[in-house]
């Protein structure tokens, strides 16, 4: 009688997360009698996956009719595979006894799990920055396997080159994470711009995942001010306007000063939007010239998005 052999024909099996993995195992003899057990890993720390005779293993089903006479097929199917199931699985024949003793092991089948990366999450700087400044964006994606992955950055469809990417951990793992930081130089036209992080992985069948960040959440475009005097509207009254142009975001407070004294404060409300996403706003002040003996210095002072105030002044001549 030839001695029993345990045959695991597949050296490796690759399965997508969520699917079932079939691990093949046959024996060449019914003798000695004793159960087949499946383990993940080898040595004293190995994990029992299935015991033909003892215990309940809800995720495991036998592929063949295992309670059939002369059954020598002990292949199993493991349902709902996750990256944590990756490893080398051994089909082991035990000899019946008290307790059962290990008789012979198969060569092992390495199970690798193909897991999709999570949707990339792009985050920008905590504080807004102004044009000509360089800001950093980060992109993170987790839970993918195998380790090979490609990450690209785009700004408005144009690929960026100034970025650094790390995949962790460096060694073997059930799943991996990617972290990338890109540097972007802001321009005044970036209110409508988008930064895109694109992740390509074998599990995505050529359809990469994208994460986006709107530069509108990052950029601050400071306003330009222009103060002009309008023709006299009525006797003793002068209309002075303050044009606040090309600012973003909308949060803006304007204060009129007459000879350094606060005349009026208002908040930008009915703004007009430019094509590039910035805003314009205009405020005017009616000055009663007859109330002044001397020339009047009018100042338009603007506080934009919590930043230090900027101002523009206009000298109003009062004729004797």
């Amino acid at each position: 009688e030839e001695e029993l052999q345990v045959i695991q024909p597949d050296k490796s099996v690759s399965v997508a997360a969520g699917e079932s993995a079939i691990l093949h195992c046959t024996v060449t003899s019914l003798i000695p009698v004793g159960p087949i057990q499946w383990f993940r890993g080898a040595g004293p720390a190995r994990e029992l996956i299935y015991n033909q005779k003892e215990g309940h293993f809800p995720r495991v089903t036998t592929v063949s009719e295992s309670t059939k006479r002369e059954n020598m097929d002990f292949s199993i199917s493991i349902s709902n595979i996750t990256p944590a199931d990756a490893g080398t699985y051994y089909c082991v024949k035990f000899r019946k006894g008290s307790p059962d003793t290990e008789f012979k092991s198969g060569a092992g089948t390495e199970l690798s799990v193909r897991a999709k990366p999570s949707a990339p999450v792009v985050s920008g700087p905590a504080a807004r920055a102004t044009p000509q400044h360089t800001v950093s964006f980060t992109c993170e994606s987790h839970g993918f396997s195998p380790r090979d992955i490609t990450l690209k950055w785009f700004k408005n469809g144009n690929e960026l080159s100034d970025f650094q990417t790390n995949v962790d951990p460096v060694g073997e793992s059930v799943s991996y994470s990617i972290h990338s930081t890109a540097k972007v130089v802001l321009t005044r036209e970036d209110v409508h711009s988008q930064v895109i992080c694109e992740v390509a992985h074998v599990t995505l069948q050529g359809d990469p995942l994208r994460g986006t960040a709107n530069l509108s959440e990052t950029i601050r475009v400071p306003p330009t001010l222009e103060v002009t005097q309008q023709p006299v509207r009525a006797e003793n009254q002068v209309n002075v306007t303050c044009q606040v142009r090309k600012f973003y975001p909308q949060r803006l407070q304007l204060t009129w000063l007459e000879n350094g004294n606060v005349s009026r404060t208002e908040t930008a409300s009915t703004v007009t939007e430019n094509k590039d996403g910035t805003y314009n706003w205009m405020s005017w002040l009616l000055v009663n010239v007859s109330a002044h003996r001397d020339d009047v210095k009018l100042t338009c002072q603007v506080e934009h998005d919590g930043q230090p105030a900027v101002s523009k002044s206009h000298d109003l001549k009062v004729s004797a």
Partner: antibody
Framework: EVKLEESGGGLMQPGGSMKLSCVAS????????MNWVRQSPEKGLEWVAE??????????HYAESVKGRFTISRDDSKSSVYLQMNNLRAEDTGIYYC????????????WGQGTTLTVSS | DIVLTQSPASLAVSLGQRATISCRAS??????????MYWYQQKPGQPPKLLIY???NLESGVPARFSGSGSGTDFTLNIHPVEEEDAATYYC?????????FGGGTKLEIK
């Protein structure tokens, strides 16, 4: 430690009914086929019935001498196997053993101590 | 049904000697190279105890002085050297097909 404990035997009149029970412990009951075998001085050891697993749809098989009169059943949640015996005859007298089939092959590796049924008027 | 005929019905063997029990089936109990024959030992007041499975394989915990052989329709149980505790009745049983049947038994006495 594997244990099989039968109960329910006793003295019955011909034509009567009786139910034998067997409680198992020390192993995963739901993974094993279970059998009843009886023994009498007249007939020696005689296989009576077999019940298979849930995955086998609890298939049952019977000796010709008891077919239609005896019913084997199991309750995996209680690790128990039963033998319902109707229309009892004198020749059903004997010790009834509850047995575990180790390898789906009438490999009777563990036997209970037995319960005695006497059918007599 | 497959009928199993055991012989002898009883035998007496001296301590340390060999006991040989035969079991003949009315039809082959062998398929695919496996011999579906089992041997049991029964002592008074106890249930039978499995000794040999698939004709020639020693059940776990059974002393090596018990051995089985045979194929097809003819099978043998050997006990050597016989010890006092081996005094019992021995049964063969087949699982070649349903229904499973047992031999009539062989009573072994130690001289």
């Amino acid at each position: 430690e594997v244990k099989l404990e039968e109960s329910g035997g006793g003295l019955m009149q011909p034509g009567g009914s009786m139910k034998l029970s067997c409680v198992a412990s020390g192993f995963t009951f739901s993974n094993y086929w279970m059998n009843w075998v009886r023994q009498s001085p007249e007939k020696g050891l005689e296989w009576v019935a077999e019940i298979r697993l849930k995955s086998n749809n609890y298939a049952t098989h019977y000796a010709e001498s008891v077919k239609g009169r005896f019913t084997i059943s199991r309750d995996d949640s209680k690790s128990s196997v039963y033998l319902q015996m109707n229309n009892l005859r004198a020749e059903d007298t004997g010790i009834y053993y509850c047995i575990r089939d180790y390898d789906y092959d009438a490999y009777f590796d563990y036997w209970g101590q037995g319960t005695t049924l006497t059918v007599s008027s | 049904d497959i009928v199993l005929t055991q012989s002898p019905a009883s035998l007496a063997v001296s301590l340390g000697q060999r006991a040989t029990i035969s079991c003949r089936a009315s039809k082959s109990v062998s398929t695919s190279g496996y011999n579906y024959m089992y041997w049991y030992q029964q002592k008074p007041g106890q249930p039978p105890k499995l000794l040999i499975y698939l004709a020639s394989n020693l059940e776990s915990g059974v002393p090596a002085r018990f051995s089985g052989s045979g194929s097809g329709t003819d099978f043998t149980l050997n006990i050597h050297p016989v010890e006092e505790e081996d005094a019992a009745t021995y049964y063969c049983q087949h699982s070649g097909e349903l229904p499973y049947t047992f031999g009539g038994g062989t009573k072994l006495e130690i001289k």
